[in-house]
Interface confidence: low
């Protein structure tokens, strides 16, 4: 029920090395890059996935920042520091001793500084807005069908509790999926919205993280939903701290 016992693989994370030498001879899988053991019955944390990705060829990406408090991942890929439970450490530094603070999805939320920079706590990203533009279709999708299909996707593929999918908005050709999860709402064992959003983002790009599964085949009443652009906005429980220079 965790790492697949028959051939010892990790169904939820193909960026792992697995061997049958865990407790009781069970299949145990470790993330590439960090070597940390992962629970293959659920999604692997974004931090460990980014770390694993950095042990493979790099391909940076750029997004744009739309508003005052919403963050997007403008900095592209970096090799993150993860804590023993796989979460991002609040302070990240590169090899040239440039440091910055990140939120729970690993996105920078302060200006860059030096090793004296303090990041007192890992600030939780409690609201994620996934903005999609779909390719032209014969007609608009039925909103309620689209809503139901996307909620099913997050529930079944990413194991995200339905209560964390706050809304699905649709104005052809733009789809917005709102994920909300406050610290107080997230129980042990709940998939983190940041991890679900990251898996979804990689799926949409045709870079599925799931072992052996085909790519994401999204259909609404049999009609393929093909995404041509994705933007993800992150809102933190505490607003980010950037200097005025950056905001102008």
């Amino acid at each position: 029920h965790t790492a697949a016992q028959d051939n010892c693989t990790c169904p939820t994370n193909k960026m792992t090395v697995c061997s049958p030498d865990g407790p009781g001879g069970r299949c145990q899988c470790r993330a590439l890059g960090s070597g940390m053991a992962v629970d293959c019955s659920t999604l692997t944390s974004k931090c460990l996935l980014l770390k694993a990705r950095m042990s493979a060829p790099k391909n940076a990406r750029t997004l744009v920042r739309p508003s005052e408090h919403a963050l997007v991942d403008n900095d592209g890929l970096y090799d993150p520091d993860c804590d023993p439970e796989g979460r991002f450490k609040a302070r990240q530094c590169n090899q040239t001793s440039v440091c910055w603070c990140v939120n729970s999805v690993g996105v920078r939320r302060t200006d860059k500084g030096d090793l004296s920079l303090r990041c007192d706590e890992l600030v939780r990203t409690h609201h994620i807005l996934i903005d999609l533009r779909h390719r032209p279709t014969a007609g608009a999708f039925n909103h309620s069908d689209l809503d139901a299909e996307l909620r099913r996707l997050f529930r079944e593929r990413y194991r995200l509790h339905p209560k964390f999918v706050a809304a699905v908005h649709y104005e052809q050709p733009t789809i917005q999926i709102e994920l909300r999860q406050n610290t107080s709402q997230k129980a042990a064992g709940d998939v983190d919205i940041g991890d679900a959003a990251y898996y979804f983002e990689r799926d949409i790009k045709g870079e599925s993280l799931f072992q052996g599964r085909g790519g994401l085949d999204l259909r609404v009443r049999g009609e393929p939903l093909q995404v041509e652009r994705t933007l993800i906005y992150y809102l933190d429980e505490i607003p980010p701290k950037f200097s005025m220079k950056r905001l102008t």
Epitope: T2, P23, Q28, M36, A37, D39, G189
Partner: antibody, heavy 121, light 107 residues
């Protein structure tokens, strides 16, 4: 076969410290967590803490924080539990037990034979 | 901390009987519950993990069920070697916690 062998019984005076060892064999030491549980005479089981043998990071139960240290010697596949400022109520059998790393695996599939620690003046 | 409450605290039964021990968690622990058997002077032995998965080598007469807050260990037909103390444990979140134990005695 997989086994955990613990150090022998100890008799300590109040205020002293004790260090119990747990040597693992029959599996790759760094692929499983090591948990510590104690059982006072005639009582139930009480979790003290665990250590991720891969990262070396320990986690302690609140009741023991400041008094307990869990450590490793990966070269000898040995885990250690040190308990300081001993009191008479620390008299118990101390067990090491193997687990996985994540919460899905925090059950104990292999146990040491136990080490009786007696605290008496 | 999550409190695990076992019942009964003791019970008497005969060889061949069907016995059920229950464990109630003070909050939702999904299916993260394990069951152990302990005999006098010995270390506990794992019987069931993740509520219903029988550990390697454990006889099929032992079974576990439940999710959320209510869990059950069932021994379908008691054997002489089954008389012991049984503990439940939640492995959902630290601090890991055990039930107070159920002593199963010969009637």
């Amino acid at each position: 076969q997989v086994q955990l062998v613990q150090s022998g019984a100890e008799v300590k005076k109040p205020g002293a410290s004790v260090k119990v060892s747990c040597k693992a064999s029959g599996y790759t030491f760094t692929t499983a967590g090591m948990q510590w549980v104690r059982q006072a005479p005639g009582q139930g089981l009480e979790w003290m803490g665990w250590i991720n043998t891969h990262s070396g990071v320990p986690k302690y139960a609140e009741d023991f924080k400041g008094r307990v240290t869990i450590s490793l010697d990966t070269s000898t596949s040995t885990a250690y539990l040190q308990l300081s400022s001993l009191k008479s109520e620390d008299t118990a059998v101390y067990y090491c037990a193997r687990s996985g790393f994540g919460s899905s695996y925090w059950y104990f599939d292999v146990w040491g034979q136990g080490t009786l620690v007696t605290v008496s003046s | 901390d999550i409190v695990m409450t076992q019942s009964p605290s003791s019970l008497s039964a005969s060889v061949g009987d069907r016995v059920t021990i229950t464990c109630k968690a003070s909050q939702d622990v999904s299916t993260a519950v394990a069951w152990y058997q302990q005999k006098p002077g010995k270390a506990p032995k794992l019987l069931i993990y993740s509520a219903s998965y029988r550990y390697t080598g454990v006889p099929s007469r032992f079974s576990g069920s439940g999710s959320g807050t209510d869990f059950t260990l069932t021994i379908s037909s008691l054997q002489p070697e089954d008389f012991a103390v049984y503990y439940c444990q939640q492995h959902y979140i630290t601090p890991l916690t055990f039930g107070q134990g159920t002593k199963l005695e010969i009637k």
